[in-house]
Interface confidence: medium
């Protein structure tokens, strides 16, 4: 009796009801190997989840995160909201990179600036909250009164930047 | 390989009680800041509580404050959320979590591993 089981292809079950024929899953189920005695039920992409493929007799639903989120977790699991360029997800919520850090996408954490002066270089274009600085020639290469770098911004302290 | 392994969650009913528990294997739990993180249905992820490696400082969301409390047994290697007075809202999808970070209530999202959760659903 197993061998029957065994020769029912994917999206199929092994009916024990039935003197082990193959029946196809029913609506809304899937099994993706053969020789299985039940079908899963497929995954349901609501509310934050969109669905990426529809569910098929041989294989689940997949799902993203709506816009405004992000997947996390093994096959998209979980959604996490974005943030703006310039923030960081943080517990309770979205804040801004303290000065000094930088994030130029919607998820992740904020970074310190570049220290252009640890290479030697000079800072070309200060960083913001969005950007990093960038980094110009060493000060030694510019030769007097022909440096086109913007002079460093007035120093702040250290701490958050206004939301 | 890291795991974590959450079990606990079920049907309660308003005003009930429930015990959600975290088993956690692959790594020295004990160095580690935990979180419980949770996803209600059609929302995104709402962080619940923190509780830093020795189980001394310990952090909640607003909305689980006072009802909610998180605890840790590293002899046993497992995270802990005893969870009181619940409430419809509380319905979700519990997720414990491995921090790389300190745990404070206001770092970032500092999280390496996930576990599969586990489903809580408070209804009468």
């Known amino acids: 009796l197993q061998d029957l089981c065994s020769n029912c292809p994917a999206g199929t079950f092994c009916d024990n009801n039935r003197s082990q024929i193959c029946s196809p899953c029913p609506p809304n189920s899937f099994s993706s190997a053969g020789g299985q005695r039940t079908c899963d039920i497929c995954r349901q992409c609501k509310g934050v989840f969109k669905t990426r493929k529809e569910c098929s007799s041989t294989s689940n639903a997949e799902c993203d995160c709506i816009s405004g989120y992000h997947c996390l977790g093994a096959e998209c699991s979980m959604c996490e909201q974005d943030c703006k360029q310039g923030q960081e997800l943080t517990k309770k919520g979205c804040k801004d990179c303290c000065f000094g850090t930088f994030n130029d996408q919607k998820r992740g954490i904020c970074r310190p600036w570049t220290n252009c002066s640890l290479d030697g270089k000079s800072v070309l274009v200060n960083g913001t909250k969005e950007r990093d600085v960038v980094c110009g020639p060493s000060p030694a290469d510019l030769s007097p009164g022909a440096s086109s770098a913007t002079p460093p911004a007035p120093a702040r302290e250290p701490g958050h930047s206004p939301q | 390989e890291v795991q974590l392994l959450e079990s606990g969650g079920g049907l309660v009913q308003p005003g009930g009680s429930l015990r959600l528990s975290c088993a956690a294997s692959?790594?020295?739990?004990?160095?580690?800041?935990m979180s419980w993180v949770r996803q209600a249905p059609g929302k995104g992820l709402e962080w619940v509580s923190s509780?830093?490696?020795?189980?001394?400082?310990?952090y909640y969301a607003d909305s689980v404050k006072g009802r909610f409390t998180i605890s840790r047994d590293n002899s046993k290697n497992t995270l802990y959320l005893q969870m009181n007075s619940l409430r419809a809202e509380d319905t979700a999808v519990y997720y414990c979590?491995?921090?790389?970070?300190?745990?404070?209530?206001?770092?970032?999202?500092?999280?390496?591993?996930w576990g599969q959760g586990t489903t809580v659903t408070v209804s009468s």
């Open positions: 509780i830093d490696a020795s189980g001394g400082d310990t």
């Open positions: 692959g790594f020295t739990f004990s160095n580690y800041a």
């Open positions: 979590a491995k921090e790389g970070s300190h745990g404070t209530d206001d770092s970032h999202y500092d999280v390496d591993v």
